[in-house]
């Protein structure tokens, strides 16, 4: 899971046999990784065990029923849940992104890697345009940054741009490239003639 921090994974050792309820234990290494990394299309365990058997949500793991809040696939009536009447396992598989694709952070959508950091938000949450780096060299420059910095809420196109001047950060993204306006675009009234 590229946007997760390395400190989220903990070594438990193959023989320790247990991870906290909110963790998944990698089969070979015994590493404990967040349960949210389970079946998320990213290989976080070295042996890939966090992406195996993803047609069935492991929501009974460690006897948790229902699982802790925030897990990717809530358990709905799994057979060994005490007092459960619905014996059906919820199918919570998420189809893997194709090779060369990136998964949006807050949705199951996949986009081409080439759309990442191109100045055009394609993910519903704009996550493909977040964390694009400071001092990142942008491709095929045909424009330079001029004018004041704007906030992330008013990011305009960075495609085909070359940054000149201060480093690009999430707090200060210059208006360049295909953009002709750096306004956020929100207003409270009806449009007025210019």
């Amino acid at each position: 899971s590229p946007l997760s921090t390395p400190t989220s994974a903990q070594a438990a050792g193959p023989s320790s046999g247990s991870c906290p309820p909110t963790k998944f234990q990698c089969r070979t290494s015994g590493l404990c990784v967040p349960l949210t990394w389970r079946c998320d299309r990213d290989l976080d365990c070295s042996d890939g065990s966090d992406e195996e058997e993803c047609r069935i949500e492991p929501c009974t793991q460690k006897g948790q029923c229902p699982p802790p809040p925030g897990l990717p696939c809530p358990c709905t009536g799994v057979s060994d849940c005490s007092g459960g009447t619905d014996k059906k396992l919820r199918n919570c598989s998420r189809l893997a992104c194709l090779a060369g694709e990136l998964r949006c952070t807050l949705s199951d959508d996949c986009i081409p890697l080439t759309w990442r950091c191109d100045g055009h938000p394609d993910c519903p949450d704009s996550s493909d345009e977040l964390g694009c780096g400071t001092n990142e060299i942008l491709p095929e420059g045909d424009a330079t940054t001029m004018g004041p910095p704007v906030t992330l809420e008013s990011v305009t196109s960075l495609r085909n741009a070359t940054t000149m001047g201060p480093p690009v950060t999430l707090e200060s993204v210059p208006s360049v490239g295909n953009a002709t306006s750096s306004s956020a675009g929100d207003q409270s009234g009806s449009p007025t003639a210019y």
Epitope: L98, A99, G100, E101, C104, S107, D109, C110, I111, P112, L113, T114, D118, H120, P121, D122, C123, P124, D125, S126, E129, E153, S154, V155, T156, S157, R159, N178, A179, S181, S183, A184, G185, D186
Partner: antibody, heavy 119, light 113 residues
Framework: DVQLQESGPDLVKPSQSLSITCTVT?????????WHWIRQFPGNKLEWMGY???????NYNPSLKSRISITRDTSKNQFFLHLSSMTNEDTATYYC????????????WGAGTTVTVSS | DIVMTQSPSSLTVTAGEKVTMSCKSS????????????LTWYQQKPGQPPKLLIY???TRKSGVPDRFTGSGSGTDFTLTISSVQAEDLAVYYC?????????FGAGTKLELK
């Protein structure tokens, strides 16, 4: 189902500015998606103009240079096209449209509004 | 910008005939990472907005009759109608939906003989 409807003037004088409204029903423009403007000239040529993303980010066709602005009114679930310094070449049918999420093609279109630039 | 060139500009056909139309892009629309071609076909009838037919060069939108087939890769694409019906008379456009600015072809007009 989401529906888009354009409204604006039929006639604009050269050098004046154009403002067109797209009213969205059946979906919140701040929830998801990007919301685009495309125009079609009398010869049938289609031109992508720009969009406003649900996050508020805007992007425009470089060919329109500094003449274009796309804004929105989230309280009315509307987004707007503003085009300044209109000329006869801006006579066209203007469509607001929306692509499916994480795509760059268009499956939902308004009926379009025809704008003539003439003195 | 990617230039989309469609040919022919018009086609005169009879009902039941098989027709093909071409769309060429000035740059490749095949993403080498996921092997998808980002080329879309639309159909437009008089007084109506364009209607999505085919995306990713060959994937029919749900509800589109299977007589419409998209093919091709890279820079050369084809839309085929296996047996033209009267309701297919329209203008057909291709679109680059890979790289901004998004660009369209000039269209191929399908007319009845």
């Amino acid at each position: 189902d989401v529906q888009l409807q354009e409204s604006g003037p039929d006639l604009v004088k050269p050098s004046q500015s154009l403002s067109i409204t797209c009213t969205v029903t059946g979906y919140s423009i701040t929830s998801d998606y990007s919301w685009h403007w495309i125009r079609q000239f009398p010869g049938n040529k289609l031109e992508w103009m720009g969009y406003i993303h649900s996050s508020g980010i805007t992007n425009y066709n470089p060919s329109l240079k500094s003449r274009i602005s796309i804004t929105r009114d989230t309280s009315k679930n509307q987004f707007f096209l503003h085009l300044s310094s209109m000329t006869n070449e801006d006579t066209a049918t203007y469509y607001c449209t929306r692509p499916p999420v994480v795509t760059r093609y268009f499956d939902v279109w308004g009926a379009g509004t025809t704008v003539t630039v003439s003195s | 910008d990617i230039v989309m060139t469609q040919s022919p500009s018009s086609l005169t056909v009879t009902a039941g005939e098989k027709v093909t139309m071409s769309c060429k892009s000035s740059q490749g629309l095949l993403d080498s990472g996921n092997q998808k071609n980002y080329l879309t076909w639309y159909q437009q009838k008089p007084g109506q907005p364009p209607k999505l037919l085919i995306y990713w060069a060959s994937t029919r939108k749900s509800g589109v009759p299977d007589r419409f087939t998209g093919s091709g890769s890279g820079t050369d694409f084809t839309l085929t109608i296996s047996s033209v019906q009267a309701e297919d008379l329209a203008v057909y456009y291709c679109q680059n939906d890979y790289t901004y600015p998004l660009t369209f072809g000039a269209g191929t007009k399908l007319e009845l003989k």
